[in-house]
Interface confidence: low
Amino acid sequence: YKLVCYYTSWSQYREGDGSCFPDALDRFLCTHIIYSFANISNDHIDTWEWNDVTLYGMLNTLKNRNPNLKTLLSVGGWNFGSQRFSKIASNTQSRRTFIKSVPPFLRTHGFDGLDLAWLYPGRRDKQHFTTLIKEMKAEFIKEAQPGKKQLLLSAALSAGKVTIDSSYDIAKISQHLDFISIMTYDFHGAWRGTTGHHSPLFRGQEDASPDRFSNTDYAVGYMLRLGAPASKLVMGIPTFGRSFTLASSETGVGAPISGPGIPGRFTKEAGTLAYYEICDFLRGATVHRILGQQVPYATKGNQWVGYDDQESVKSKVQYLKDRQLAGAMVWALDLDDFQGSFCGQDLRFPLTNAIKDALAAT
């Protein structure tokens, strides 16, 4: 099985024990590590952070001791902007320029492939996204002709039904991608006005959402139905939780909220907590399991957080094995307890290790 793990370059800027550089990663933990994110400047792939080149080097030296490890560079992301991607993909010249710029950039910096993180193609971009993938793959095949190892091509896709329907021609893009990471998290957010788990495995009786689509099982099943081969589908598992501020004394699933949860000490983003911050939060908190959804949540005071733990990730891995998927994807290594100092297990990357162990179990 594949274990595809994202690393985010901006994690270097977190304070103190939250700061994560690629040299802190475990070279034997994942089969693939994806560095997020690269930029596109003047239609050419480019660095984003001032020190990206240094960090690329740090990451790719991990392969010296584990030649089986593959590294990919992810281009795009939330801050890149969908319209910018649309501009490049929809214009033949821009697209060609971008595609041509990718192989030399990846080779120069020691990456084994490219991950496309267009978040998200609009309703009019579906065809352009397909064309971009098809032409990128053709370029990778051509570039590898002189006997080089062919560069890998993957894409991170939304798990939301509305986005899947409007953005992706699943059957077509699947033909050209080496694997597809489906982002089976962020199903529930503060916009709903109630508590709810952002990455439930199943819908469950507890789901107060207005639809039946907001769960991992539906998203995976839907992708398969649309023509994604199970052998290329990698299922996303988050090492972060989504938190809410409760608006009343109710604390269960579907309880009213006044907004996102208070920012974590290190990640400093309202409504989001890294797993290592959750381990801190759990001291003195009340933990519940949402039985039907097979995921936990915890409450403390007026704070509510839905997250994944070692038990829930094992359930998810069992599920992806039952579905005969290609493996698991983790967002993100730097949100796991990468130092092993927060979660009291004296183990670095406890969630990702639990996923790895479950994948390896017979």
């Epitope: 609009g122 939301g160 509305v162 962020d186 199903f187 916009w191 207005p210 639809d211 907001s214």
Partner: antibody
Framework: QIQLVQSGPELKKPGETVKISCKAS????????MHWVKQTPGKGLKWMVW????????TYADDFKGRFAFSLETSASTAYLQINNLKNEDTATYFC????????????WGQGTLVTVSA | DIVLTQSPASLAVSLGQRATISCRAS??????????MHWYQQKPGQPPKLLIY???NLESGVPARFSGSGSGTDFTLNIHPVEEEDAATYYC?????????FGGGTKLEIK
């Protein structure tokens, strides 16, 4: 700050052509879609078109196919609405509006341009 | 096309009381996680002003006395307590699919 400034009121005769403008400032014009909305006197609002500001490609509501032309001058961060062969029922205030984000409603509006068609 | 029907067409509410405006869609405007319904306030001679986006999110700078709720086909805008300056016409609008459409409007009068 972000502003959409529209051209002034127009008085036209039936059969004539009018072209109104919407100049955007305070943001990168090609980063956000632009829309036009029609409001007839004392009546409600009617969505007319969505324009991809990067490609210039318009997507029309059925009622606004034919006599209506939408264009962009990207270098001037300006969107245009042209109505050909004007009819009395085109008398209305036309607003340009910018999407807040993906599908999140129109947070920025032009002040509106009143087009009066009268013989 | 999705038709949005607002009710009532007009209402008069006393200062400090609650105003409730409904918007019914001819088919669901909700999808995975989002309800693509927005509410606007319009005063004479002015463009509409976004109050609530994605059914329940308060636009920045809009007073907390405005709130939105609903999913699927039924949505509500509540104003409580109503103030003098709230006299205006209110519109719902969906962005679920093209063409985007507006409701017919509700005129709010303050007694």
């Amino acid at each position: 700050q972000i502003q959409l400034v529209q051209s002034g009121p127009e008085l036209k005769k039936p059969g004539e052509t009018v072209k109104i403008s919407c100049k955007a400032s305070g943001y990168t014009f090609t980063d956000y879609s632009m829309h036009w909305v029609k409001q007839t006197p004392g009546k409600g609002l009617k969505w007319m078109v969505w324009i991809n500001t990067e490609t210039g490609e318009p997507t029309y509501a059925d009622d606004f196919k034919g006599r209506f032309a939408f264009s962009l001058e990207t270098s001037a961060s300006t969107a245009y609405l042209q109505i050909n062969n004007l009819k009395n029922e085109d008398t209305a205030t036309y607003f340009c509006a910018r999407e807040y984000g993906n599908y999140e409603g129109f947070v920025y509006w032009g002040q509106g341009t009143l087009v009066t068609v009268s013989a | 096309d999705i038709v949005l029907t607002q009710s009532p067409a007009s209402l008069a509410v006393s200062l400090g009381q609650r105003a409730t405006i409904s918007c019914r869609a001819s088919k669901s405007v909700s999808t995975s996680g989002y309800s693509y319904m927005h509410w606007y306030q319009q005063k004479p001679g002015q463009p509409p002003k976004l109050l609530i986006y994605l059914a329940s999110n308060l636009e920045s700078g809009v007073p907390a006395r405005f709130s939105g709720s609903g999913s699927g086909t039924d949505f509500t805008l509540n104003i409580h307590p109503v103030e003098e300056e709230d006299a205006a016409t209110y519109y719902c609008q969906h962005s679920r699919e093209l063409p985007w459409t507006f409701g017919g409007g509700t005129k709010l009068e303050i007694k």
